[in-house]
Amino acid sequence: QDPWAAEPRAACGPSSCYALFPRRRTFLEAWRACRELGGDLATPRTPEEAQRVDSLVGAGPASRLLWIGLQRQARQCQLQRPLRGFTWTTGDQDTAFTNWAQPASGGPCPAQRCVALEASGEHRWLEGSCTLAVDGYLCQFGFEGACPALQDEAGQAGPAVYTTPFHLVSTEFEWLPFGSVAAVQCQAGRGASLLCVKQPEGGVGWSRAGPLCLGTGCSPDNGGCEHECVEEVDGHVSCRCTEGFRLAADGRSCEDPCAQAPCEQQCEPGGPQGYSCHCRLGFRPAEDDPHRCVDTDECQIAGVCQQMCVNYVGGFECYCSEGHELEADGISCSPAGAMGAQASQDLGDELLDDGEDEEDEDEAWKAFNGGWTEMPGILWMEPTQPPDFALAYRPSFPEDREPQIPYPEPTWPPPLSAPRVPYHSSVLSVTRPVVVSATHPTLPSAHQPPVIPATHPALSRDHQIPVIAANYPDLPSAYQPGILSVSHSAQPPAHQPPMISTKYPELFPAHQSPMFPDTRVAGTQTTTHLPGIPPNHAPLVTTLGAQLPPQAPDALVLRTQATQLPIIPTAQPSLTTTSRSPVSPAHQISVPAATQPAALPTLLPSQSPTNQTSPISPTHPHSKAPQIPREDGPSPKLALWLPSPAPTAAPTALGEAGLAEHSQRDDRWL
């Protein structure tokens, strides 16, 4: 079979499949396409895996190239290493196999590069521009187990037709991944459908044993059918179920799959367990329990926004820094007036920027270096050099002032960058087991603080308290706070409708703007001081393994990641901020200072966890930083996330920045 025929093809083993898609795509598009199907770009790490890839690719023409899952950021050459500084899209650099077309050359690696495999000859690895659309791509799908291909039976009308969970249909599989369907047509006219399912005794196997093409009739024993038995003309039987029931995997018994299904939001019959739980738009299955639903924090997903991102229950928005406008794709930012871009909810198959570095990128930073930036309702900064302390505490914030906080020059790209671009999917719930396992981090290592999701029900907005957490590589692991990543539960605030609308989900009412304590008004200027930890605020020490206290479901993260700022005393860190023309709340609520809320969305930079690793930047000084698909053009120059268009920042001696435009987006990356 010509591997370059129009249709994709796959080769499967007992624990994984490789699939060849002869579709012209850029690296980013290919990566996205594999992820949408629950897999990843191929990562042939061993000679055995490479051999399977070779047999799948076959002998194509020399002009054909296929993306595999290797990418390198600019200036990340490590020519002495087997992968030469390239990182697998799964986030690591482990390999027992390479197949470079040329020996490593000692160039400066000025730009981002991706790897394509030659379809001809020895299927060598070539590096090149990630924005080129090569002829196809190789995906890899891992699974819990596989069923062997069915043996042909005498009564079969033709070979079994298999459909894999990643939608490939073929008769030529040796192994079928868990979740595959086999359709067998019998000469007598009747067929059988089998599912590759988990067996009660462990492992996986076909949902029914053969022979599949023998007829017995309905009598005796009702043909083995629990409800109705239908005797076909040829004497074969088929079982049917009464209304509201589904035929079980054995093809004989009937079940109401959703009767006992403990789904938090939506249940649908079907799937390996007989039912599948679905989450509404903007939610995803909880990691520890797929029956429950938690809010999807899109801002944790790489490349969701080019510059700035704000997450909230059931939606998110992209923003651009002052002087930039949001482009029509709702993601990218361009200099104001340059493109005439408009904020848009159009969610076509947009292509993000390539992310290849430019030498003069640093120029754009100069205006912001060490400057003050107005950030209403937000605490976030990432200095290049950290203070030598670790602090996490919860001040109470009056709700009638807008804060400003110093914004040191960030490090970009971040030390640990995750797959840079998620995919668009019209599916609004996750039912693909592989997707869940592929996109959720494993347990953190000793040197990577855990992400501690808030899994308890979200408190009302009036009881959400921000948490400021500092994360420093220099500290012993026992003193490094875990970064608290927030997941809202499905419960909406009382004033919001229970279902987040698919168009324009409600953002934050004006009275929910969180503010800082000790605010003094001087004319139109508001000066805010963050004092040392007052007695009525117990320090929240978020060490490794710390759990988010139930009273703080929405933790706003103030992260610093770097190495050598001057030491600041831990007892009395202070933060002086200034803002002009504070926004008046729609209605003010008097709350005692100690319990005053900060109704904050989860506001995070547009960077995400690396697949199968902890999503926190490595705090160990020698940790390697995997760089995963990133084609998002010149790096965002500011990472400030605002719940509403920013007021004009008060000019200071050190420069200013604000947000010019944002786009409300409610599609969810799954």
């Epitope: 370059w4 012209r24 850029t26 023409p61 020399a62 002009s63 054909r64 190239l65 470079w100 077309a101 040329q102 020996p103 050359s105 000025p110 730009a111 981002q112 394509a116 030659e118 001809s120 070539l126 590096e127 090149g128 521009s129 990630c130 924005t131 080129l132 659309a133 090569v134 920027d353 390539d354 290849e356 084609e631 053009g633 010149p634």
Partner: antibody, heavy 124, light 108 residues
């Protein structure tokens, strides 16, 4: 060595069809995409489209769509360009060029070899 | 379509001078940029591919740099045989290939 040679009538009447031939030698014809590029006198280069001799896959510049047809004959290592309904605006030197695949361990889609060009004048 | 804006459109320099030509893409094209040299009456020749890689047999005085949207082509020491028109070309935005308007280099 790799060579590309364009040939065709130097004069075409308006509204008629321009036909050009590009003969390739010195490499495996089906391994490389062939591009066609137009250059009006004293002006810059304009990409018309390409054809992949391996599978006859073609991609055309929107500007020429509907008027352009590209074909190959792999037995004679020849690519063909046909441009219908020509006007004086189509007076130009037409080049065929080979798209590269890889150099020194890099893959790349720049045009590494060009024919010498064929001048076509559209005039009645 | 991606536009490639090349500047200057023409320049005069003395033998031995350093000559720089710039090209700006209307959107990010990564490093999928080539520089071509066309001497009068001849076909274009590939000098630089992938923004910064010198093609086989091209003298070392020719170099290229850039990625994303801004690209630079440099002749470090202009020679008489370098009199030609130079074009930048992007080839990332499949299926469209586009060229810059060209820069005519002359000797003073």
């Amino acid at each position: 060595q790799v060579q590309l040679q364009e040939s065709g009538p130097g004069l075409v009447r308006p509204s008629q069809t321009l036909s050009l031939t590009c003969t390739a030698s010195g490499y495996t014809f089906t391994d490389y995409v062939i591009h066609w590029v137009k250059q009006p006198p004293g002006r810059g280069l304009e990409w018309i489209g390409y054809i992949n001799p391996y599978d006859d896959d073609t991609t055309y510049n929107q500007k020429f769509k509907g008027r352009v047809t590209m074909l190959v004959d792999t037995s004679s290592n020849t690519a063909y360009l046909r441009l219908s309904s020509v006007t004086a605006e189509d007076t130009a030197v037409y080049y065929c060029a080979r798209r590269g695949n890889s150099y020194d361990g890099y893959f790349d889609y720049s045009m590494d070899y060009w024919g010498q060009g064929s001048l076509v004048t559209v005039s009645s | 379509d991606i536009q490639m804006t090349q500047s200057p459109s023409s320049l005069s320099a003395s033998v031995g001078d350093r000559v720089t030509i710039t090209c700006r893409a209307s959107q990010n094209v990564g490093t999928a940029v080539a520089w071509l040299q066309q001497t009068p009456g001849k076909a274009p020749k590939l000098l630089i591919y992938s923004a910064s890689n010198r093609y086989t047999g091209v003298p070392s005085r020719f170099s290229g740099s850039g990625s994303g949207t801004d690209y630079t082509f440099t002749i470090s020491s202009l020679q008489p045989e370098d009199i030609a028109t130079y074009y930048c070309q992007q080839y990332t935005n499949y299926p469209m290939y586009t060229f810059g308007q060209g820069t005519k280099v002359q000797i003073k």
